[in-house]
Interface confidence: low
């Protein structure tokens, strides 16, 4: 008996050939002897099978002695032995239909689990192997699970189902919903405008949901909601915003926030969450703001930074074109009785300058100038 594997939703063509190369009487039946289709002269006739309008043939091939059974939009329950009766002979074809589906949705949040479920006909014992877009292979039986989805898992998953030494391949497109970056840090001098951007790592035709930016200022004892917004078909509308700071938000994607000016009291960490319609869970992106201030008070020149800096960052004060007068792995440095000239405050990481603020120290009888 010939075995043919089919995919749920696809079309399969079961062949039946007569020795005479001409159109003769034929019909296809299932294992219950219920007629599916046949011919009446040059007309196709249908029996009372549940295949209904999904069964067809190719009349153009009948004159060549070929009488295929075409089944469209295959269902698992179409798995059966199909019998072609032609010229007093019977040709039997066993059709096994498999389906492979993602647990709930093919759009999943980063960190969620992907479960692929194989639908198979009773009595079959298939094996499945799937290859992720990043080349990871997983094997299983009826279900295959991948926990903690990563951004790199977005793309086409190719799964091969093996049964009776025959195989059928499924391709499932998975979209991992996430921000492009899990975390970002912005370095600004006091008074500068701050731009926060939250680009998404996926594109969908319609994107609807709501979001919020919670902010934990370094100086504050608790976090505060700075802004809440809605997203409708990729259009952003602000619902509520604090008066201090008064953030501004772009109306289009990518999500874009503007802080009018960097101030020490705003330095800290924020968490932007985005809840998408019809999705459980939220997308998260952390954003950090580091603010630098250089001041001269009487005989003391001070440079300070606020916000989440790593212990390996170096803060330095130096006179322009000279060696650093002071360098420390701390958040404040100062120089007493600084010489007149242009002083630079530098925040650096392994020699790379992250943030720089200049302050002009005038001779002692003048007041300092901050460019």
């Amino acid at each position: 008996k010939k075995v043919v594997l089919g995919k749920k939703g696809d079309t399969v063509e079961l062949t039946c050939t007569a020795s005479q190369k001409k159109s003769i009487q034929f019909h296809w039946k299932n294992s219950n002897q219920i007629k599916i289709l046949g011919n009446q002269g040059s007309f196709l006739t249908k029996g009372p099978s549940k295949l209904n309008d999904r069964a067809d043939s190719r009349r153009s091939l009948w004159d060549q002695g070929n009488f295929p059974l075409i089944i469209k939009n295959l269902k698992i329950e179409d798995s059966d032995t199909y019998i072609c009766e032609v010229e007093d002979q019977k040709e039997e074809v066993q059709l096994l239909v498999f389906g492979l589906t993602a647990n709930s949705d093919t759009h999943l949040l980063q960190g969620q689990s992907l479960t692929l479920t194989l639908e198979s006909p009773p009595g079959s014992s298939p094996s499945v192997q799937c290859r992720s877009p990043r080349g990871k292979n997983i094997q299983g039986g009826k279900t295959l699970s991948v926990s903690q989805l990563e951004l790199q898992d977005s793309g086409t998953w190719t799964c091969t189902v093996l049964q009776n030494q025959k195989k059928v391949e499924f391709k499932i497109d998975i979209v991992v919903l996430a921000f492009q970056k899990a975390s970002s840090i912005v370095y600004k001098k006091e008074g500068e405008q701050v731009e926060f951007s939250f680009p998404l790592a996926f594109t969908v035709e319609k994107l609807t949901g709501s979001g919020e930016l919670w902010w934990q200022a370094e100086r504050a004892s608790s976090s505060k909601s700075w802004i809440t917004f809605d997203l409708k078909n990729k259009e952003v509308s602000v619902k509520r915003v604090t008066q201090d700071p008064k953030l501004q938000m772009g109306k289009k994607l990518p999500l874009h926030l503007t802080l009018p000016q960097a101030l020490p009291q705003y330095a800290g960490s924020g968490n932007l969450t985005l809840a998408l319609e019809a999705k459980t869970g939220k997308l998260h992106q952390e954003v950090n703001l580091v603010v630098m201030r250089a001041t001269q008070l009487q005989k003391n020149l001070t440079c300070e930074v606020w916000g989440p800096t790593s212990p390996k960052l170096m803060l330095s004060l130096k006179l322009e074109n000279k060696e650093a007068k002071v360098s420390k792995r701390e958040k404040a440095v100062w120089v007493l009785n600084p010489e007149a000239g242009m002083w630079q405050c530098l925040l650096s990481d392994s020699g790379q300058v992250l943030l720089e603020s200049n302050i002009k120290v005038l001779p002692t009888w003048s007041t300092p100038v901050q460019p």
């Epitope: 289709l37 007309f43 196709l44 006739t45 249908k46 009372p48 549940k50 209904n52 309008d53 067809d56 009349r59």
Partner: antibody
Framework: QVQLVQSGAEVKKPGASVKVSCKAS????????ISWVRQAPGQGLEWMGE????????YYNEKFKGRVTNTRDTSTSTVYMELSSLRSEDTAVYYC???????????WGQGTLVTVSS | DIVMTQSPDSLAVSLGERATINCKAS??????????MNWYQQKPGQPPKLLIY???NLESGVPQRFSGSGSGTDFTLTISSLQAEDVAVYYC?????????FGGGTKVEIK
Amino acid sequence: QVQLVQSGAEVKKPGASVKVSCKASGYTFTAYVISWVRQAPGQGLEWMGEIYPGSGSSYYNEKFKGRVTNTRDTSTSTVYMELSSLRSEDTAVYYCARSGDGSRFVYWGQGTLVTVSS
Amino acid sequence: DIVMTQSPDSLAVSLGERATINCKASQSVDYDGDSYMNWYQQKPGQPPKLLIYVASNLESGVPQRFSGSGSGTDFTLTISSLQAEDVAVYYCQQSLQDPPTFGGGTKVEIK
């Protein structure tokens, strides 16, 4: 717009045959299944069978098998339903109806009253 | 064949009041997450008109006061606020298995 226009009322004697036509317009004729549904006076709706205008293949309700024949003429976008060996209980309004997805009937003809009386 | 049983046979409701019609199938009409149940309205001398398809989807152009619910074997058509033009006979119909079968109808009148 989609229209299904049926032939006029018929009076037949028991044992005779009747052939009702349904002319389709406003869409691709071969793309949708046409069903026949009948309704006896003061009664409910009963599906008789359907025809696939593309292939001409038909499927009938077991109750009417052997008595009903559906045909089509693609040149005039017309479907025909012939019911033979008429009896008095076949007196009904016969409707043609076009399916949407699956067997739900979105568009209907105006109906043809067939009266079987001796 | 799947037998469809509608209740009540007739229903008298005041204008602006809610009307509820029930339909029970002799076996489940669910398949692959959908319920293959449709509802029609028929006025005297007219062909039936499709109102609701796949249990709860409103056909284009049908007023929002009509809604459908249910799954498996038990289904309901609700008219939230009956209008004079809603006086008609309402039929349920399953479209899962051939032959498609209809309920016996429910006549809705104004009290």
